[in-house]
């Protein structure tokens, strides 16, 4: 099996943003995600 | 873009309570999330509290939940914060800010405009 290793020489932050869920539907209360690299994964 | 101007800061001694209002003009307020955020000297501005455009929907800072209370009034474009069982470390300068409808609410960013800020100070 290959072997793959992170060792990019850079720290890559996360950041949890939160987004009201009726910007987006109907539904109420806020939705939770988690920005890693710039990229929203969750 | 909407104008955004803080009151009700002041002196209160630890466990007391305030509350805060921030006044908007412009037409468009109720399509923008609002949120209150602190600034205690030398630190960076943090979040504290957000309130959907509508009113419906609320989300807290771990460190005031439970204690503080974010409201807003779409007839009389303002939103407030009652904040109770105040303490020292609730010191800061606050702000009221609008975000567009869409953005992260708990990041400084999101925000486009910003009132001047009013001054807690909780006295031990």
């Known amino acids: 099996d290959a072997e793959f290793r992170h060792d990019s020489g850079y720290e890559v932050h996360h950041q949890k943003l939160v987004f009201f869920a009726e910007d987006v539907g109907s539904n109420k209360g806020a939705i939770i995600g988690l920005m890693v690299g710039g990229v929203v994964i969750a | 873009e909407v104008q955004l101007v803080e009151s009700g800061g002041g002196l209160v001694q630890a466990g007391g309570s305030l509350r805060l209002s921030c006044a908007a003009s412009g037409r468009t307020f109720n399509n923008y999330n609002m949120g209150w955020f602190r600034q205690a000297p030398g630190k960076e501005r943090e979040f504290v509290a957000a309130?959907?455009?509508?009113?419906?929907?609320?989300y807290y800072a771990d460190s005031v939940k439970g204690r503080f209370t974010i409201s807003r009034d779409n007839a009389k474009n303002a939103v407030y914060l009652q904040m109770n069982s105040l303490k020292p470390e609730d010191t800061a300068i606050y702000y009221c800010?609008?975000?567009?409808?869409?953005?992260?609410?708990?990041?400084?960013?999101?925000?486009?405009?910003w009132g001047q800020g009013t001054q807690v100070t909780v006295s031990s």
């Open positions: 800010g609008a975000a567009y409808r869409g953005t992260a609410i708990n990041v400084r960013r999101s925000y486009d405009s």
């Open positions: 309130v959907s455009r509508s009113g419906v929907s609320t």
